[in-house]
């Protein structure tokens, strides 16, 4: 139904608290460099305006679209050009072009210091002084660093953050109470951010059909008892919600998400028995609970997939009459039977099935052509299974740090043009997937690994698009969303790469490395390893092992020495010479 004033409608639906939070997130995600105080001032102005529209929907400007109101607010900032440069050029455009222009200026990697956590005492003092302002500051700091964070979920994490502080600031040992709670919130929020970023990339780079396919697969795995028609209804609503959030229409997104949660709770009998525990919770927790819900049990007596998708003589007729519905049904039926497969696998299988029908349905005897389709799709299942098995074996053998090193070598060989800090960052992220997934039971390992890899590779692709350095990375990132991981896996040593000349500086260490925290020490060593591979991309595994062994012995010796700096000065050049000889 149409409302006279969109902003009044959303204010009424969301309530003042959530409304203000979402306005703050919107501004922080678009204006990532502005100080917190400036945003607070704008939030108050927008809120006062919304209240005026609630009182009189016909009041001046109340009928404008919310995006237009936000755009007008942003364009009225006097320091816009000096702070944001060409973003100010967006203000010369008319909506919807202005909105698109703002979106293009969102920075996925803003030049901001890491979000450091103050000491528990300082945290609690600030929280007790003014907890609304404190939580507002949390929303601001997270939003400006994660400009695509799923806004209603961020409100949920802010609530969790507030609850943790409320409880722990009264505890005798604040640090012991707070640290594990805040660590857990941080870890979950980072994963949530990456998941939403993948959804936005899927919509923006590959279109609505790609996102809908992803959603059908995911929801069919979670709700295997729901009918395809029910899954399709939810997917349509979910697509609208996701598009709104990815587009920066956060008030609409949060409101529509509430509506979707309400719909699912009203129809839980035909969706999933697991919804019961979510539907009794308050708004934010309800939607979060549904998002994280455990999958329902598979219905018993599911017929063999081949009955409808191979043996049925009407396959090509059904494919011609309603291609997307037929393929959607295939994806639904396949996904609900295979909760242990990753989304990527399921989509590759559906893509393979589609390609087979495209070919076979054009033949005189289609059935004879596609009769063995499931056998032909088997490699799409075997390849990731084998890859996960091999990598988890390597992880078990080497441990997380050693596994990261192996990945640093592997990915430097694949894309040596990528900067050393970036390669180390991604090797470490990819290596941590081993920790997250390899200890899981066989049935969960596969989906855990590939689903996490999709998030990490998406981040790599987004940052690489900003400053492209490798054609091979661009190709893997842009050709197909579902084939990204197999594409990267298939890359081997880049034969076109001209090895980097040897710079002793890259391998020169000082005594300060001995006092660094373990993580930073590892990063320094991994930077040297990557530089080494860039210098000798075709070095054998044995050569690399020898060099790394010598390197570790050198660090241990010098860090244990009485005169550390003298040891580094004396033995450093010897190590460099020895490494060069080993790799010659």
């Amino acid at each position: 139904e149409a409302h006279k004033s969109e902003i009044a409608h959303r204010f009424n639906d969301l309530g003042e608290g959530h409304f203000k939070g979402l306005v703050l997130i919107t501004l922080s995600q678009h204006l990532q460099k502005s100080p917190f105080e400036e945003h607070v001032k704008l939030v108050n102005e927008v809120t006062d305006f919304a209240k005026a529209c609630v009182a009189d929907e016909s009041a001046q400007n109340c009928g404008k679209a919310i995006a237009t109101l936000f755009g007008d607010k942003v364009c009225a900032i006097p320091s816009l050009r000096e702070t944001y440069g060409e973003l100010a050029d967006c203000c010369a455009k008319e909506d919807p072009d202005r909105v698109e222009c703002f979106l293009q200026h969102k920075d996925d990697n803003p030049n901001l210091p890491p979000f450091e956590r103050p000491e528990p005492e300082a945290l609690c003092t600030a929280f007790k002084e003014n907890n609304d302002r404190f939580i507002g500051h949390y929303l601001y700091e997270v939003s400006r660093r994660h400009p695509y964070f799923y806004a209603p979920e961020l409100l949920y994490y802010a609530e969790k953050y507030k609850n943790a502080l409320t409880e722990c600031c009264e505890a005798a040992d604040k640090a012991a109470c707070l640290t594990p709670k805040l660590d857990a919130i941080k870890e979950k929020a980072l994963v949530s951010s990456a998941q939403q970023r993948l959804k936005c990339a899927s919509l923006q780079k590959f279109g609505e059909r790609a996102f809908k396919a992803w959603s059908v697969a995911r929801l069919s795995q979670k709700f295997p008892k729901a009918e395809f028609a029910e899954i399709s209804t939810i997917v349509t609503s979910l697509t609208k919600v996701t598009k709104e959030c990815c587009h920066g229409d956060l008030l609409e997104c949060a409101d529509d998400r509430q509506e979707l949660a309400k719909y699912m709770c009203e129809h839980q009998d035909s969706i999933s028995s697991k919804l019961k525990e979510c539907c009794v919770k308050p708004t934010l927790q309800k939607a979060h609970c549904i998002l994280e819900i455990q999958r329902d049990e598979l219905p018993t007596e599911l017929p063999d997939l081949a009955v409808d998708f191979v043996e049925d003589k009407e396959v090509c007729k059904n494919f011609a009459e309603a291609k997307d519905v037929f393929l959607g049904t295939f994806l639904y039926e396949y996904s609900r039977r295979h909760p242990e497969y990753s989304i990527g696998m399921l989509l590759r299988i559906a893509k393979g099935y589609e390609a087979k029908l495209e070919k076979c349905c054009a033949e005189a005897d289609p059935h004879a052509c596609y009769a063995k389709v499931f056998d032909e799709l088997q490699p799409l299942i075997d390849e990731p299974k084998k890859l996960v098995q091999q990598n988890c074996e390597l992880f078990d053998k080497l441990g997380e740090y050693g596994f990261q090193n192996a990945l640093a070598v592997r990915y430097t060989q694949k894309a040596p043009q990528v900067s050393t800090p970036t390669l180390v960052e991604y090797a470490r992220k990819l290596g941590s997937v081993g920790t997250k997934c390899c200890s899981l039971p066989e049935t969960e390992r596969l989906s855990c690994t590939e689903n996490y890899l999709a998030l990490i590779l998406n981040r790599l692709c987004i940052l690489h698009e900003k400053t492209p350095v490798s054609e091979r990375v661009t190709k893997c990132c842009t050709e197909s969303l579902v084939n990204r991981r197999p594409c990267f896996s298939a890359l081997h040593v880049d034969e076109t790469y001209v090895p980097k000349p040897f710079h002793a500086d890259s391998f020169t260490f000082h005594a300060d490395i001995c006092t660094l925290p373990e993580k930073e020490k590892q990063v320094k060593k991994q930077m040297a390893l990557v530089e080494l591979v860039k210098h000798k991309p075709k070095a054998s595994e044995e050569q690399m092992k020898t060099v790394m062994g010598d390197f570790a012995a050198f660090l241990k010796k010098c860090c244990d020495a009485d005169n550390k700096e003298a040891c580094f000065t004396e033995d450093g050049p010897k190590l460099v010479a020895k490494c060069q000889a080993t790799l010659a």
């Epitope: 009407e314 349905c361 054009a362 289609p366």
Partner: nanobody, 115 residues
Framework: EVQLVESGGGVVQPGNSLRLSCAAS????????MSWVRQAPGKGLEWVSS????????LYADSVKGRFTISRDNAKTTLYLQMNSLRPEDTALYYC????????SSQGTLVTVSS
């Protein structure tokens, strides 16, 4: 919406010829193999002939081999069945279908062969 409309049927004497047409719309015609199937009075559906999307491959039931010729014009999105040396046992409702489908999703065209 997929539509298949057959035409060209009629009453003929044994040994004579008929040419059936099937006008297709609502899908990418050239991407799909097409078939003719028929249903004699009081009998089940019987497959007659199939042709690939490009028109290069054809298949025929033994009962019509050497007498019937299937063809297509992708530009006109039309399927044809040239029937020569017709016999009384060819009397049936003829339907065109997508792929190897053995179903009636259209009205069909009646062919009666009788002296």
């Amino acid at each position: 919406e997929v539509q298949l409309v057959e035409s060209g049927g009629g009453v003929v004497q044994p040994g004579n010829s008929l040419r059936l047409s099937c006008a297709a719309s609502g899908f990418t015609f050239s991407s799909f193999g097409m078939s003719w199937v028929r249903q004699a009075p009081g009998k089940g559906l019987e497959w007659v002939s199939s042709i690939s999307g490009s028109g290069s491959d054809t298949l025929y039931a033994d009962s019509v081999k050497g007498r019937f010729t299937i063809s297509r014009d992708n530009a006109k999105t039309t399927l044809y069945l040239q029937m020569n040396s017709l016999r009384p046992e060819d009397t049936a409702l003829y339907y065109c279908t997508i792929g190897g489908s053995l179903s009636r999703s259209s009205q069909g065209t009646l062919v009666t062969v009788s002296s």
